[in-house]
Interface confidence: low
């Protein structure tokens, strides 16, 4: 239904608080370097304007699209050219090109200072002094660092953030109450951001069809009792929501997500038996809960897939009449029967099925040609199963830190051109698959592990896209969304790589390492490990282990010394010399 004023429509639907929060998120995700105060000012102006449109939808400019209104507002920032360089050229374009231009300039790795957590008392004072500004700052800081964060979900995080401070700032031991909650929000937030980044990459790089295929598979696993028509409706609506959020249309996205949650809850009897608790919650919690809901039980008497998709004489006829619908039904039927498969595996199977039908339906005897199609699935299923089995065994043997180190070495050898911080970040996250998924029983391991790895490898892909340095990374990232993980797994040591010149400065450490948290200390050591591999790509596991053990002992020794700085200087020189000797540098 067309509204005279889109901005008034969204303001009324969302309410002032959510409207302001979403506009702040949108602006911070576009102009990631702008100061908080500037964004607040812009948001206040937009909000005041929206109120004039609510009062009179025919008022001047109220009929303009949200992109026009928001784009005009962003283009008034005086320092656009100095701060953002060529992004300022977007302002010379007309909609919709201007918004596309802004989207292209979103930076997945903005040059922003690390968020340092102040003392608990300082945070609680700030929270009590001005709760509204405190929460706005949270939205702003997360949004500008995560320009694709799922906006309605960020409202949910902000609500939990507020609840944590409300509860803990009046607790006897504020820190014991608050810090674990903030750690949990931080970790969940990073995971949520990365998951949404994959959805946006899927839509933007591989198109709506790829996203819809992913959604059919995932929703069919989650709601196996729902009929295909119901799943298709949910997929269409979900695709609209994510297309809007990934496109910067956050007000529409949040509004449509709320409508989708409402629809799901009104129709839960025909969707899933697991939704009851979710649907009793308030809106933000309800939407989050639905998105995370466990898979419903599979219907008991599902017939064999072969009847409709292999044995039937009508396979080619059905395929020819409506290819995507028929493939969608195949994916739906396969996925609802296989909650034990990863979504990406299901999509590989569907792709194999499609390729086989394309070939066979043009053959002299189509049925003879595609009769053995399910046999082709066997190696596709076994490959991730074996990989997960091997890596979980390695994880259980080594523990998370050393497992991460093994992956660091593996991936640095595969793609040594990638920057050290990116290799450390991505390998650390790849290594977390162990503690996240290996504890699960066999039936849950693959969906946990392989779909998580897809999210992490997408981080590598988006970071690499910003400054491409490796043809191999580009190839694995762009050729096929569902085959990214097998593509990276198949990479061997890059024999073309010319080892990096040895630089002693890279391996010079100071006493400040002693005051770092365990996590930060690990990152320092892992950074050194990547650099070692870049210097000596052919180093054996044993050589690298010896050097890293020496390094750990060196840090431990100097951190216990009275004169730490002198120890780091003198022992450090010895360590570098010994390492060079050990590696034959």
């Amino acid at each position: 239904d067309a509204h005279k004023s889109e901005v008034a429509h969204r303001f009324k639907d969302l309410g002032e608080e959510n409207f302001k929060a979403l506009v702040l998120i949108a602006f911070a995700q576009y102009l990631q370097q702008c100061p908080f105060e500037d964004h607040v000012k812009l948001v206040n102006e937009v909000t005041e304007f929206a109120k004039t449109c609510v009062a009179d939808e025919s008022a001047e400019n109220c009929d303009k699209s949200l992109h026009t209104l928001f784009g005009d507002k962003l283009c008034t920032v005086a320092t656009l050219r100095e701060t953002y360089g060529e992004m300022a050229d977007c302002c010379a374009k007309q909609e919709p090109e201007r918004n596309e231009c802004f989207l292209q300039h979103k930076d997945d790795n903005p040059n922003l200072p690390r968020l340092v957590r102040p003392e608990v008392d300082v945070m609680c004072t700030a929270f009590h002094d001005n709760e509204e500004t405190f929460l706005k700052k949270y939205l702003y800081e997360i949004a500008r660092r995560h320009p694709y964060f799922y906006a309605p979900e960020l409202l949910f995080f902000a609500k939990r953030y507020k609840a944590a401070f409300t509860e803990c700032c009046q607790a006897a031991d504020k820190a014991a109450c608050l810090l674990p909650k903030l750690d949990e929000l931080r970790d969940e937030g990073k995971a949520s951001s990365a998951k949404q980044r994959l959805k946006c990459a899927s839509l933007q790089k591989f198109g709506e069809r790829a996203f819809k295929a992913w959604a059919v598979a995932r929703l069919s696993q989650r709601f196996p009792k729902a009929e295909f028509a119901e799943v298709s409706k949910l997929v269409t609506d979900l695709t609209k929501v994510h297309t809007e959020c990934c496109h910067g249309d956050l007000l529409e996205c949040a509004d449509d997500r709320a409508d989708l949650a409402k629809y799901i809850c009104e129709n839960q009897d025909s969707i899933s038996s697991k939704l009851k608790e979710c649907c009793e919650k308030p809106l933000l919690e309800k939407s989050h809960c639905i998105a995370e809901v466990e898979n419903d039980e599979m219907p008991a008497d599902l017939p064999s897939l072969a009847a409709d998709f292999v044995e039937s004489k009508d396979v080619c006829k059905n395929y020819a009449e409506a290819k995507d619908v028929f493939l969608g039904m195949f994916l739906y039927e396969y996925a609802r029967r296989h909650p034990d498969y990863s979504v990406v595996l299901l999509l590989r199977l569907a792709k194999t099925y499609e390729t086989t039908l394309e070939k066979c339906c043009a053959a002299a005897d189509p049925h003879e040609c595609y009769a053995k199609v399910f046999d082709e699935f066997k190696p596709l299923v076994e490959e991730p199963q074996n990989l997960i089995k091997q890596n979980c065994e390695l994880f259980e043997q080594l523990g998370e830190y050393k497992f991460q180190n093994a992956l660091l070495v593996r991936y640095t050898k595969k793609v040594p051109q990638v920057s050290t911080p990116t290799l450390v970040e991505v390998s650390r996250n790849l290594g977390k698959v162990g503690s996240k998924c290996c504890k699960h029983p066999e039936a849950k391991r693959m969906p946990c592990a392989e779909d998580y790895l897809s999210v992490v490898l997408n981080q590598l892909c988006v970071l690499h896209e910003k400054t491409p340095v490796s043809d191999r990374v580009t190839k694995c990232c762009t050729e096929s969304l569902v085959n990214r993980r097998p593509c990276f797994s198949a990479l061997e040591v890059d024999e073309t790589y010319v080892p990096k010149e040895f630089n002693a400065e890279t391996f010079t450490f100071h006493a400040d390492i002693c005051t770092l948290s365990e996590k930060e200390r690990q990152i320092k050591k892992q950074t050194a490990l990547v650099e070692l591999v870049k210097h000596k790509p052919k180093a054996t596991k044993e050589q690298l282990k010896a050097v890293m053990d020496d390094f750990a002992a060196f840090v431990e020794k100097c951190c216990k010394a009275d004169d730490k700085e002198t120890c780091f200087a003198e022992e450090g020189k010895k360590l570098v010399a010994a390492s060079q000797a050990a590696l034959g540098l």
Partner: antibody, heavy 120, light 110 residues
């Protein structure tokens, strides 16, 4: 460099008309609303009127009818009719902070002002 | 029309002192209020907008607060360069007369 510069004849006889000009540089009038403010000697600031990015005008009640604001691509004009001695003042042009949909914002950039004296 | 009433109209204070100037709007203007500083023979300078947001380059000793009809400007510790005249100004979107200035407060050295 972003700046505003007012100019115009300083002395005018009572009941006469006068135009003063504000020349802008370093930004576009299609992005910012422009406002005229005056300050009689030893007195406070008085808002005269504003011209929006789209060229619409808005005046203080006391200024309606006698004062009119217009603009071209780089200049903003204030035309004053039937001037009286109590119109003697320093006349400033000022730019809004950012374009706002209703074109009313704080005044973040001011010209140096031009003194208009109405005297016989 | 909105009328802005500023008080006091003049004020004497010493270096290092904390001073507060108030401004009252005849009807609610939300947070749409700015504060300016003007020194003799000089152009006005923006200090605060949206009632409490400090303009860039303005020292942190200047603090604005309030919303609706009651607003204040506080200077936490007077410096020699702060002796000037201060004006509040509303910018109301819904009003046909968009802007209204207060009468000014002259801050003098004691």
């Amino acid at each position: 460099q972003v700046q505003l510069k007012e100019s115009g004849p300083g002395l005018v006889a009572p009941s006469q008309s006068l135009s003063i000009t504000c020349t802008v540089s370093g930004f576009s009038l299609s992005r910012y609303a422009m406002t005229w403010v005056r300050q009689p000697p030893g007195k406070g600031l008085e808002w005269i009127g504003t011209i929006t990015t789209g060229g619409n005008t808005n005046y203080a009640n006391w200024a309606k009818g006698r004062f009119s604001i217009s603009k071209d691509s780089t200049q903003v004009f204030l035309k004053m009719n039937s001037l009286q001695t109590d119109d003697t003042a320093m006349y400033y042009c000022a730019r809004g902070g950012y374009v706002s949909y209703a074109d009313a914002t704080e005044l973040s950039l001011w010209g140096q002002g031009t003194l208009v004296t109405v005297s016989s | 029309d909105i009328v802005m009433t500023q008080s006091p109209s003049s004020l004497s204070a010493s270096l290092g002192e904390r001073v507060t100037i108030t401004c009252q709007a005849s009807q609610s203007i939300g947070s749409r209020l700015a504060w300016y500083q003007q020194k003799p023979g000089k152009t006005p300078k923006l200090l605060i907008f949206y009632a409490s947001t400090v303009a860039s380059g303005v020292p942190s000793r200047f603090k604005g607060s309030g919303s609706g009809t009651e607003f204040s400007l506080t200077i936490s510790s007077l410096q020699p360069e702060d002796f000037a005249t201060y004006y509040c100004q509303s910018y109301d979107y819904s009003s046909s007369s968009s802007y209204a200035f207060g009468g000014g407060t002259k801050l003098e050295i004691k």
